[in-house]
């Protein structure tokens, strides 16, 4: 995303070659003031030394126009045109293309597999604790507690289908009512959006890429949070989801269907089951207060078992516990009865890595968490690199136009709805909204898809995952069919309601604006992305959980003032931006508050102090790895390498820390762009050059 046109021979910084250049009056008052306050001296020039001439023409074109950081970057084609290639070159190009496609599919495959393993890792680390959240009896009476349990459990197990299936089994066994289950499902919907936000963090190396990727990922979060903010109170007041879904379930005479088709899993399962296999029933059993399950391992050891039913004599406390009076007897002291007992005979062990290690679940979980995050990160980097090399020139133009262009007038409004359908269809194919949205994230980052287009695709993904749940519900056994179908329909109608709230009218597309705002903040202060993740997905839910356990009075006592302050701040912010004259002078800005309460700068300084010592060694490692990678891939020397390091170096340069001399392949334009603070050319340079 070059801030101004580049010329091969244009000197990156003309001011260095026009010494003593000053200007009495800046041409671009906004940006130049902001970015170069220190140089704003009004002293006349005394010395004018001519240095070798460099073309600065390109640097003063339209000086007042600043690129919108949300505009898609132009992916320039540096290669030779197809028509200019000879036969050998064309064949080589075709093979390169095929090779890249194979590599792309390969990395995409491992990317999806690592997401699956990541989910397993989270379940091993936090699954049992997540299961215990469900066994809390207050869920029945407190929808807010249900909501945060849904969020926390889904975040801990990294799978909304796991938390939903626990809810289904609890409803089926009457441990939970459908009414109490609905907030949990809403929470699960929020929790599942953490995955693509984690994936977006992997693109932190490039500011502009990160801005787009993070905003593209968090648009899902904001949609879910906002939907819950509106629909949970509506549901508590009217129970519309419960009533509507009950009417649907009762009006149909469902028969058990076929199993929901496993589409993507067919390809990924053979690989992921070699890594680890989990016994998902354990979490459900813990949720249903099964004491024996607490000591069971989630790691599956026996994959082939034979379950035999046998009649067994067992003692019972009294005759009332007998299966039937005729099947009851005494040995003179104890009462005995005959019961059908199923016993499992282990036949064959599973074939995964951890089957013979007998490590505790936490250890296996941590190992897998580290490995899957590394693989996820590596695959993502490689996908972005390959896509970057493929999506250039004509290809990029075609793809970007296809994805981001609207239908011709008057059908332009239909484009978004088609995108919703595409998102739903794709999610249905991959059988996971996390996989689809996570695959979408790097595409948003590199600028193939706009956030405006990613938004309906994400909404469609939310619908797609519920259709999968409905199919799975229809395939469930008779005893759970009704409850699982009703819960799947609740999930479906919740997402439909959310779409109706936050999509049809462009003005109501708040999630896009909020995500862009967060994207801008996170691009400037990258630590804020992790901060956001921790606060929204862990701290807030855990706080609400803790307060809910303390009881309604405590929850209301703490919650009401907090909500009041938030509303007050939002109203004040709205008035400040729309009609500040209504407010007293003191309230027209936030300066009346301490700096740390209205700016992230002081916090940034504190965090930089703590993370500083780790940055340079990390960057050296990053740079070495990147160079090696460039050598292996045969990238040109100008490849965008170690962007995070360039940012760091620029920051140190500004503070007067000597950094290595710029090399021929250190593209300043790119590093400026990476900083996310696209600057207009320095006014002083412009005037002197003119």
């Amino acid at each position: 995303m070059a801030p101004w046109p580049e010329l091969g021979d244009a000197q990156p910084n003309p001011s260095k070659y026009l010494e003593g250049a000053t200007s009495q009056q800046p041409i671009t008052p906004d940006k130049s003031k902001e970015t170069n306050k220190t140089d704003n001296t009004e002293v006349p020039v005394t010395k004018f030394e001519l240095l070798p001439t460099y073309s600065t023409a390109t640097l003063i074109e339209e000086p007042t126009e600043v690129d919108d950081p949300w505009n898609l970057p132009t992916l320039q084609d540096s290669g030779i045109k197809w028509s200019e290639r000879d036969a050998k070159g064309k064949i080589l190009c075709v093979f390169q293309g095929i090779g890249r496609l194979i590599l792309l599919l390969g990395f995409l495959y491992f990317f999806v597999c690592s997401l699956d393993v990541l989910s397993s890792a989270f379940q091993l680390v936090g699954g049992k604790m997540a299961g215990q959240f469900f066994s809390n009896s207050s869920i029945m009476s407190n929808p807010l507690l249900g909501l945060v349990i849904g969020v926390l459990v889904t975040v801990f197990v990294q799978s909304s289908s796991t938390s939903t299936s626990i809810v289904v089994s609890m409803v089926a066994s009457s441990l939970l009512t459908v009414r109490a289950a609905i907030p949990i499902i809403m929470g699960a919907n929020i929790g599942t959006s953490i995955t693509n936000t984690i994936v977006a963090l992997m693109q932190v190396g490039d500011r502009s890429e990160f801005r787009r990727a993070f905003a593209g990922a968090t648009v899902h979060d904001f949609f879910n949070w906002l939907s819950v903010l509106v629909l949970l109170p509506v549901e508590v007041a009217t129970h519309y989801l419960e009533v509507v879904t009950q009417l649907i379930v009762e009006s149909f005479h469902f028969k058990n269907g076929e199993d929901a088709p496993d589409l993507l899993k067919v390809i990924t399962k053979p690989f992921t089951k070699l890594i680890v296999q989990l016994d998902k029933k354990v979490i459900s059993q813990i949720a249903m207060n099964d004491e024996t399950a607490k000591n069971k391992s989630l790691v599956k050891i026996w994959c082939k078992t034979f379950t035999n039913m046998t009649q067994m004599n067992v003692t019972v406390p009294s005759m009332a516990n007998c299966t039937s009076p005729s099947l009851c007897w005494t040995d003179g002291i104890q009462i005995w009865t005959m019961k059908n007992v199923t016993y499992k005979e282990n036949i064959a062990k599973c074939q995964h890595i951890f089957v013979n290690f007998h490590l505790p679940d936490l250890a296996v979980g941590i190992i897998l968490l580290i490995i899957s995050l590394l693989v996820l990160c590596g695959c993502l980097i490689m996908i972005v690199k390959i896509l970057g090399s493929v999506l250039k020139g004509q290809v990029a133009t075609v793809i970007k136009k296809t994805i981001n262009t609207d239908f011709p007038f008057p059908f332009a409004w239909l484009t978004g709805y088609l995108a919703i359908l595409v998102g739903a269809g794709m999610t249905f194919i991959v059988q996971s909204s996390s996989v689809f949205t996570s695959a979408l994230t790097p595409l948003i980052g590199i600028g193939v898809i706009t956030i405006e287009r990613a938004y309906p695709l994400t909404l469609g993904s939310n619908i797609g995952t519920t259709t999968t749940a409905i199919l799975a519900a229809l395939a469930s056994p008779g005893n759970t069919l009704r409850s699982s179908l009703q819960i799947a329909l609740c999930h479906f109608f919740f997402n439909i309601s959310g779409i109706l709230l936050w999509y049809p009218i462009p003005f109501t597309r708040l999630p896009i604006r909020m995500a862009k705002g967060l994207g801008n903040i996170s691009a400037k202060y990258r630590w804020f992305a992790i901060f956001y993740l921790i606060i929204f997905f862990f701290l807030i839910p855990l706080t609400v959980f803790g307060l809910s356990l303390a009881g309604w009075p405590v929850l209301v006592g703490v919650g009401v003032p907090v909500v009041f302050i938030i509303i007050l701040v939002l109203c004040l912010r709205l008035l400040q931006s729309r009609c500040p004259r209504v407010l007293p002078k003191k309230l027209q800005n936030w300066n009346f508050l301490p700096l740390c309460m209205h700016s992230l700068k002081p916090w940034d300084a504190v965090i930089s102090k703590f993370t500083g010592p780790f940055q340079m060694p990390c960057c050296c490692c990053c740079r070495v790895c990147c160079r090696v990678c460039c050598l292996l891939c045969g990238c040109p020397k100008c490849c965008r390498c170690s962007k995070c390091c360039q940012d760091l170096e620029e920051g140190q340069e500004a503070q007067g820390v000597p950094v290595k001399a710029p090399e021929t392949f250190d593209n300043i334009t790119i590093s400026r762009e990476a900083q996310g603070e696209v600057r207009a050319p320095d006014s002083k340079t412009e005037c002197t050059a003119l």
Partner: antibody, heavy 119, light 107 residues
């Protein structure tokens, strides 16, 4: 092989107590219940109660409750049955019998102890 | 308490005869019934348990049948050593109870 050897015959006065022993061998003493059954002269069999030597748990026929006490000594693999407040109608042959595991059939019996109650 | 009534109380038969003794329970006892043989001056000996299962070492001429409230002990071919008193017992519930006995004599 399983053997149950009971103590010898006893003659008691009304109101007195009698303690009959039953020494077992040939099996794991703590795994099976031990029953006590009596048979009055020329009459049928009557169940008095049972003891589980493993835990010392007992169950008595309501008819004898308050008068009967059953104990087990695991060190000698012996069970005891004490009947107090003897009456003339308590004159009978008292048998100890091993209960089959898991139900109330009695597979091995002692030779019996004749208790005579007379003034 | 569950009452067990045996019939007949006395039975005369010859060697080689097929003999059937009946035991009726006052309420459903399932199959929790055992049969014993007792010879004068001796302790009872277990023949059948669970209404139909022969105890180890018991000759095959002894068989049991029935469930619920009616049970039978059948001796297919009487042998000289079979002349004794036979008792049925229920262990469906406490207290364990026995029938009054059926005395089998030589005709």
């Amino acid at each position: 092989q399983v053997q149950l050897v009971q103590s010898g015959a006893e003659v008691k006065k009304p109101g007195a107590s009698v303690k009959v022993s039953c020494k077992t061998s040939g099996y794991t003493f703590t795994t099976n219940n031990m029953h006590w059954v009596r048979q009055a002269p020329g009459q049928g069999l009557e169940w008095i109660g049972a003891i589980y030597p493993g835990s010392g748990a007992t169950a008595y026929n309501q008819k004898f409750k308050g008068r009967v006490t059953m104990t087990a000594d695991t060190s000698t693999s012996t069970v005891y049955m004490e009947l107090s407040s003897l009456r003339s109608e308590d004159t009978a042959v008292y048998y100890c019998a091993r209960g089959m595991y898991g139900h109330g059939a009695m597979d091995y019996w002692g030779q019996g102890t004749l208790v005579t109650v007379s003034s | 308490d569950i009452q067990l009534t045996q019939s007949p109380s006395f039975l005369s038969a010859s060697v080689g005869d097929r003999v059937t003794i009946t035991c009726k329970a006052s309420q459903d006892v399932g199959t929790a019934v055992a049969w014993y043989q007792q010879k004068p001056g001796k302790a009872p000996k277990l023949l059948i348990y669970w209404a139909t299962t022969r105890h180890s070492g018991v000759p095959s001429r002894f068989s049991g049948s029935g469930s619920g409230t009616e049970f039978t002990l059948t001796i297919s071919s009487l042998q000289p050593e079979d002349f004794a008193t036979y008792y049925c017992q229920q262990y469906s519930s406490n207290p364990l109870t026995f029938g009054q006995g059926t005395k089998l004599e030589i005709k």
